[in-house]
């Protein structure tokens, strides 16, 4: 008789990511009877909701539900029916929602009921919809990228299963950007964390762990660009806004009433003689980066030192891993790669932002041209906040990895988010037999 | 704009493939899924299926598995429908389109031209 | 698969009168999409996500119903709305269309 292949014992989690630009579903699978291993839990799919973020739907809530329906159409495809009723479902919500909320509580909630109301039609075990604070927001990034790379297992290796390894137990630092918000989190060497809202602490399998972490709101790429252009058109003589920020020979008119729309921007809001304004791209990235300079306050700093608006920020410490857009901006500058210097970067940089507009449309045919129009000033933001936001050195940079994926997951949040509400990190190292899950983070 | 521009009409033999294209414009060509329509005798529309230009997925309805290929080439902005062992019944206009929300969540819904495809001895 | 079927197949209103297509779904459906063709053109998108008229769109049209029911109404016809109208579901793969009704003018 023929042996037949017994089912696969697994289980599935879906955690959907409601960004400030886009919202991503991930599906993640692991082996049931292996749950409290480090490093099991593995990504098999991405669905990108097609369509901005959820807080766009602010006017339109009803048609949420039409928003996420082909990924979660897909996730109905991918886990089998059999396992779809004990699939936990979860969406965190970030910086886009969090300035939906300082804007208006109300109107925040109206979002997140729909979201509930829709993600509740399917078969799943849907288990809630919030926005996640930036401080998790961090320390969910860190778990991920250390989860994945294998920080968390006692047993050492002498052979190195995933890039970046350095085998040894050292964990590495995570550095996420998004649209609306960054966040450096990591495990000073023996520093006092001086500041309590920065300092989190873990005991993950058995070791206990002091983290370091902020969330700078208002300071990923998409954000900062609405500060930067309120901030410049504060000055500017006429409605006419030469930036260095865009191509030469770029054009673009934009609403000062969409420039003001945004929580981000409320420091610079001031009474304009006119309702639009036109920027006009010179392509100068020396003088960019001056410009976003001016949006970082280093002048003031009640701790022994600060990244910038006075949050404190610890001596740099290991290897950090760079992911979400870091890692998008610069794969589509091509400067991913880890022997290219700091120096080479900038060199690059300035190249780039210095190309004619017509001729970078025609060089990148098939992207938007509102996405292509920023990678100048994307990457002369990334460098910025790197080197004089977060004290990176040009010696240092060598130890920044940009990475998208580890061992095939995303870097990123929703894992960690996942595993630590499945309960599946243990804070004691597990035996044999899985413990009891009473003493989970 | 978005727009979708679809090659021209064919003329093919029982038992024979063709390759349909579609060229898309004015949008980030990752950003939505692309899907593919059929339309016999001027009437009927029935749904071929789709690919996600940002991971490759494909979906197929099941009545044309094994009928219809789809691919991308990024490079281009361009998606392709290969259908094989023609017959008569594959006679038809075949549609791309694609739909969703863009950047300020207003939902729009565009189609190519039509490719009519005709399988004749 | 979700089946969806309209009726009637054919209709021949007078100006000015009212219209409404019916679309019935074999199973619940969230949302109903409706297009109108005319011959030799695509199909184009008329009212989206059961109620809500896309670009362009007479204020003469609305959209109603709700779960397997659901239907498209024309407030006065006018001669420019002769054509077949198509409802379709993004519920659930695969998506589907109703087989049209087609609308001429008595």
């Known amino acids: 008789t023929q042996n037949k292949a017994l089912p696969e014992n697994v289980k599935y989690g879906i955690v959907l990511d409601a960004g400030s630009s886009h919202t991503s579903l991930y599906i993640y699978k692991w082996p049931a009877e292996k749950e409290n291993d480090t490093g099991v839990v593995h990504q098999v799919e991405e669905c990108r909701v097609k369509g901005p973020g959820i807080s766009k739907f602010v006017q339109k809530v009803n048609e949420i539900g039409i928003y996420l329906t082909d990924c979660m159409e897909r996730a109905r495809e991918v886990i089998p029916r059999s396992q779809h009723q004990e699939t936990p479902v979860y969406l965190g919500a970030t910086a886009g929602m969090r300035l939906l909320r300082m804007e208006s509580e109300e109107l925040a909630d109206r979002v997140l009921d729909v979201v509930e109301r829709s993600l509740s039609n399917y078969p799943f075990d849907f288990q809630g919809a919030r926005i996640i604070t930036g401080q998790e927001e961090g320390a969910y990034g860190w778990i991920t990228i250390n989860y994945l790379l294998g920080k968390f297992s006692q047993k050492t290796r002498w052979f190195s299963i995933v890039p970046y390894e350095t085998n040894n137990q050292e964990t590495f630092g995570a550095l996420d950007l998004g649209g609306a918000s960054t966040q450096v989190t990591f495990v000073p060497q023996n520093q006092t964390i001086e500041s309590p809202d920065n300092a989190l602490q873990f005991r993950l399998y058995g070791k206990d762990y002091n983290v370091y972490t902020h969330s700078f709101l208002c300071y990923g790429k998409d954000q900062a660009l609405w500060q930067k252009l309120a901030k410049d058109i504060q000055v500017a003589s006429n409605e006419i806004l030469r930036d260095p920020c865009f191509h030469p020979g770029y054009k673009k008119v934009v609403n000062v009433s969409d420039l003001y729309k945004t929580p981000c921007t409320k420091r610079f809001e001031m009474t304009l003689p006119f309702q639009q304004f036109e920027i006009q791209g010179i392509g100068n990235y020396q003088q960019c980066h001056q410009s976003i300079l001016e949006l970082f306050n280093t002048s003031y700093c009640p701790y022994s030192q600060c990244a910038f608006n006075g949050i404190f920020l610890p001596p740099l410490q290991g290897d950090f891993g760079a992911f979400s857009a870091f890692y998008f901006v610069m794969k589509f500058l091509n400067l991913t790669s880890e022997k290219v210097s700091q120096e080479k970067v900038t060199e690059m940089m300035k190249k780039f932002c210095a190309q004619p507009w017509e001729e970078i449309k025609t060089s990148y045919a098939g992207v938007k041209e509102k996405y292509l129009s920023e990678y100048c000033f994307s990457g002369t933001y990334i460098l910025s906040l790197l080197l004089q936001g977060y004290h990176f050195t040009a010696d240092s940079w060598e130890h920044i990895h940009f990475i998208g994926k580890i061992q095939g997951s995303d870097a990123g949040w929703t894992l960690g988010y996942m595993l630590n509400l499945t309960n599946m990190i243990p804070a004691e190292q597990p035996l044999s037999t899985p413990l009891s899950h009473s003493t989970y983070v | 704009e978005v727009q979708l521009q679809q090659s021209g009409p064919e003329l093919e033999k029982p038992g024979a493939s063709v390759k349909i294209s579609c060229k898309v414009s004015g949008y980030s060509f990752t950003d939505y899924n692309l899907n593919w329509v059929k339309q016999y005798n001027g009437k009927n529309l029935e749904w071929i299926g789709n690919?996600?230009?940002?991971?490759?997925?494909?979906r197929y309805n099941q009545k044309f598995k094994g009928k219809a290929t789809l691919t991308i080439d990024q490079s281009s902005s361009t998606a392709y429908m290969h259908l094989k062992s023609l017959t008569s019944e594959d006679s038809a206009v075949y549609y791309c389109?694609?739909?969703?929300?863009?950047?300020?969540?207003?939902?729009?819904?565009?189609w190519g031209q039509g490719t009519t495809l005709t399988v004749s001895s | 698969e979700i089946v969806l079927t309209q009726s009637p197949a054919i209709m021949s209103p007078s100006p000015g009168e009212k219209v409404t297509i019916a679309c019935s779904a074999s199973?619940?459906?969230?949302?109903m999409h409706w297009f109108q063709q005319k011959p030799g053109t695509s199909p184009k998108l008329w009212i989206y996500?059961?109620?809500n008229l896309a670009s362009g769109v007479p204020a003469r049209f609305s959209g109603s119903g709700s779960g397997t029911s659901y239907s498209l109404t024309i407030s006065r016809m006018e001669a420019e709305d002769v054509a077949t109208y198509y409802c379709q579901q993004r519920s659930s793969y695969p998506l589907t269309f109703g087989a049209g009704t087609k609308l001429e003018l008595k």
């Open positions: 199973s619940s459906v969230s949302y």
């Open positions: 996500a059961t109620s």
């Open positions: 690919i996600d230009p940002y991971s490759g997925g494909t």
């Open positions: 389109g694609l739909y969703g929300y863009d950047d300020d969540a207003n939902y729009f819904d565009d």
